[in-house]
């Protein structure tokens, strides 16, 4: 590390004095200090001498000696005070520029350390500092305004008490620049616009930034529009607003509108689309299939998307039958707006009951007329089975009726012993009925089929079982012949989901 002579941290001299500062290092050394007159420099290998024969207040400052060849970058410093009774301040710069929230150093150096107790910082013409100005003082460096704000961009003076009166420095202009985080913030409203030809329309493009230096323009299909600009300042931001007013829109006004703003940090742009239509429109659609099948007891949401201009004047869900005359409860209907011209309407149908199968229609109306979208809801049911013994054309016949949806398939089983359900070990014979007779098949109802099993003689120690199944489940009914006639077992094994 270089060594300075005299080996003191501070040196106090009077104006006109001779000052010699010598620096010695291992290699070549260099001096660095405030730019001031009358210094002469003499270098001799590993030493360097800075001297003046006529010190002035302007020589006040910190002089640092460094050794450029030192990898550790060591340095030594000495602070020189030239205490001039007429000049308590040596101002090193008359303009200081910082960004907001940085510390701003106002470099007014005190020429006499004794005066430190009576120093203060003021604005020019003796005005006090702004409220919340947080500052500190160092006799070697000057006043530091901490975390400077844009509003503190002012002209300042350093004040010292000398013989009971305040002596001011020359003024220092502080410029605090806003930190511009990026291009201006933009809004373009509306985000989407639809108008019927001849109607009025308004598009507003606005940009804001912490700094006043930015440009904004509105363009239509890449053509820059000449629109007067309104400027404002609030919430610590500069705002520039462009408003396009169209009294009677026509098809040439349609298209893409872009709001573009730029500053030193770059450019931002946002776009919207303006549609001009000949007349009002109302379109209904659904992402769902309009024919729905749901298992009884399950829940279903029916959703309709509506695109309309002008806005809807009315809408509702209606149950069109064929069962009860009940109507969907309003609390089960829900509307959500995706944006100005698109809406989603949902009808919630929880835990569906048989009487709720049928047609559900969504109706909507606007000045363009009314539209409807109808869903057909069919419920799926597991089969229900019953068996009776009868005579057809003189032959003993087991008659099995099965109802469910989708249409059930029927299988007959004959098994040994008396049981309410044939298991594999007991089965003697199996008959599949590929084409049972359809007794009823109305829309939204269960399908009822009938299967006949002609039995010449009923075996008394046996069970005849009719099983029906579909995609929902299965059902069965066991028939047990007994000597006094016939006995049937309702389905203890009532339903079964494969």
């Amino acid at each position: 590390i270089p060594v300075i002579e005299p080996s003191v941290p501070e040196l106090v001299v009077k104006p006109g004095a001779t000052v010699t500062l010598r620096c010695v290092g291992n290699g070549s050394v260099e001096w660095d200090g405030p730019p001031s007159p009358h210094w002469t420099l003499y270098s001799d290998g590993s030493s360097s001498i800075l001297s003046t024969n006529n010190a002035t207040f302007q020589n006040t400052g910190t002089y640092r000696c460094t050794e450029p060849g030192d990898p550790l970058g060591g340095s030594a410093a000495i602070h020189l005070y030239v205490k001039d009774p007429a000049r308590p301040w040596n101002v090193l710069a008359q303009e200081v520029v910082v960004f907001e929230d940085q510390d701003a150093l106002l470099p007014c150096l005190l020429t006499d350390p004794v005066l430190e107790a009576g120093v203060s910082l003021v604005r020019v013409r003796g005005r006090p500092l702004m409220r919340h100005t947080n500052y500190s003082f160092s006799p070697w460096h000057g006043f530091t305004i901490h975390r400077a704000k844009f509003i503190q961009s002012q002209d300042y003076q350093c004040s010292a008490l000398m013989g009971g009166r305040k002596v001011m420095s020359i003024s220092i202009r502080l410029k605090v620049q806003k930190v511009i985080p990026g291009p201006p913030a933009l809004t373009l409203v509306p985000a989407e616009l639809v108008r019927i030809r001849g109607e009025a329309a308004q598009i507003v493009c606005s940009a804001s930034s912490v700094d006043v230096n930015f440009d904004v323009f509105l363009q239509h299909n890449n053509t820059k529009l000449a629109i007067p600009q309104q400027s404002d300042f609030h919430n610590n931001r500069y705002q520039k607003v462009l408003t396009l007013n169209l009294d009677q829109v026509d098809f040439q006004h349609a298209g893409n509108y872009s709001c573009v703003a730029s500053n030193v940090q770059g450019k931002h742009s946002t776009s919207m689309f303006f549609r001009v239509v000949e007349s009002a429109y109302l379109n209904l659609s659904s992402e769902q299939n309009l024919i729905q099948e749901v298992t009884v007891g399950e829940g279903l949401n029916l959703k309709v998307m509506v695109e309309a201009y002008p806005g809807l004047q009315g809408f509702n869900w209606t149950y069109l039958g064929p069962f009860s005359d009940h109507q969907p409860e309003p609390k089960l209907a829900n509307a959500t707006t995706k944006d100005t011209y698109r809406h989603t309407f949902t009808l919630s149908l929880p835990r569906l009951k048989p009487s709720e199968a049928g047609r559900y229609s969504f109706l909507a109306r606007n000045p363009g007329g009314w539209r409807a979208l109808t869903f057909e809801l069919t419920l799926r049911y597991p089969p229900e089975v019953s068996v009776i013994w009868t005579f057809i054309n003189g032959s003993g016949t087991l008659l099995c009726a099965a109802s469910g949806y989708p249409q059930p398939n029927v299988t007959w089983l004959q098994c040994s012993g008396h049981t309410d359900r044939c298991d594999e070990a007991q089965v003697l014979q199996v008959w599949d009925d590929p084409y049972p007779e359809v007794l009823s098949q109305e829309p939204f109802h269960k399908v009822t089929v009938q299967s006949l099993l002609t039995v010449e003689t009923l075996e008394h120690n046996q069970t005849y079982e009719c099983r029906a199944h579909n995609s929902v489940g299965s059902g069965s009914w066991a028939f047990i012949p007994i000597s006094a006639g016939a006995h049937t077992h309702p389905p203890d094994e009532f339903l079964f989901t494969p």
Epitope: N301, P350, R351
Partner: antibody
Framework: RVQLKESGPGLVAPSQSLSITCTVS????????ISWIRQSPGKGLEWLGV???????NYNSPFMSRLRISKDDSRSQVFLKVNRLQTDDTAIYYC??????????WGAGTTVTVSS | KIVMTQSPKSMSVSVGERVSLSCKAS??????VSWYQQKPEQSPKLLIY???NRYTGVPDRFTGSGSATDFTLTISSVQAEDLADYSC????????FGTGTKLEIK
């Protein structure tokens, strides 16, 4: 006052059938649906099925093959029959008034233990 | 099958404390969620239906909220008589219930 009261056998042997009767008062079975819900220590509350006011039934899939619910409107009674019981059918069985979107009134429950 | 998951399994609170019980559905169930309180040796009682509607006679310290898959039962100021199991259930499709949260009083 709306009330539901279950009556059951208490103890049932494995592979046998369980029959429980629920007697209601303070409302009519022709106007309200009734669900059966059970509570076993390991499984919490489990919905078994419902009999609608009109007499139709709807069962929870896992129980479809061995469950039957029926009723007698005139006697204000609902019946639950469960076949082929196993030890994990041990539970408290509740009959509950079912308002479709929630269950507003619960019976006191009947404890059924399946054990040999 | 829609699975209802409740958390925490149990919690211990002091009288006067505010408590929130969570219930999550494995699929969107709209607002078809109800909350049931079951005190020891008693059958469940309906507290909240339709996610946020308080059933007749239920004290107003009980509040329900939520929709789609996330639901909450809040007791604004727990009382000693609130010691119970709390279960949520959905009724959009075949009804299912959560496994319950046991509320203990410190």
């Amino acid at each position: 006052r709306v009330q539901l009261k279950e009556s059951g056998p208490g103890l049932v042997a494995p592979s046998q059938s369980l029959s429980i009767t629920c007697t209601v008062s303070g409302f009519s079975l022709t106007s309200y649906d009734i669900s059966w819900i059970r509570q076993s220590p390991g499984k919490g509350l489990e919905w078994l099925g419902v009999i609608w006011s009109g007499g139709g039934t709807n069962y929870n899939s896992p129980f479809m093959s061995r469950l039957r619910i029926s009723k007698d409107d005139s006697r204000s009674q609902v019946f639950l029959k469960v076949n082929r019981l196993q030890t994990d059918d041990t539970a408290i069985y509740y009959c509950v008034r079912d308002l479709r979107l929630y269950f507003d009134v619960w019976g006191a429950g009947t404890t059924v233990t399946v054990s040999s | 099958k829609i699975v209802m998951t409740q958390s925490p399994k149990s919690m211990s609170v002091s009288v006067g404390e505010r408590v929130s019980l969570s219930c999550k559905a494995s699929e969107d169930v709209g607002t078809y969620v109800s909350w049931y309180q079951q005190k020891p040796e008693q059958s469940p009682k309906l507290l909240i239906y339709g996610s946020s509607n308080r059933y007749t006679g239920v004290p107003d310290r009980f509040t329900g909220s939520g929709s789609a898959t996330d639901f909450t039962l809040t007791i604004s100021s727990v009382q000693a008589e609130d010691l119970a199991d709390y279960s949520c259930g959905q009724s959009f499709t075949y009804p299912t219930f959560g496994t319950g949260t046991k509320l203990e009083i410190k």
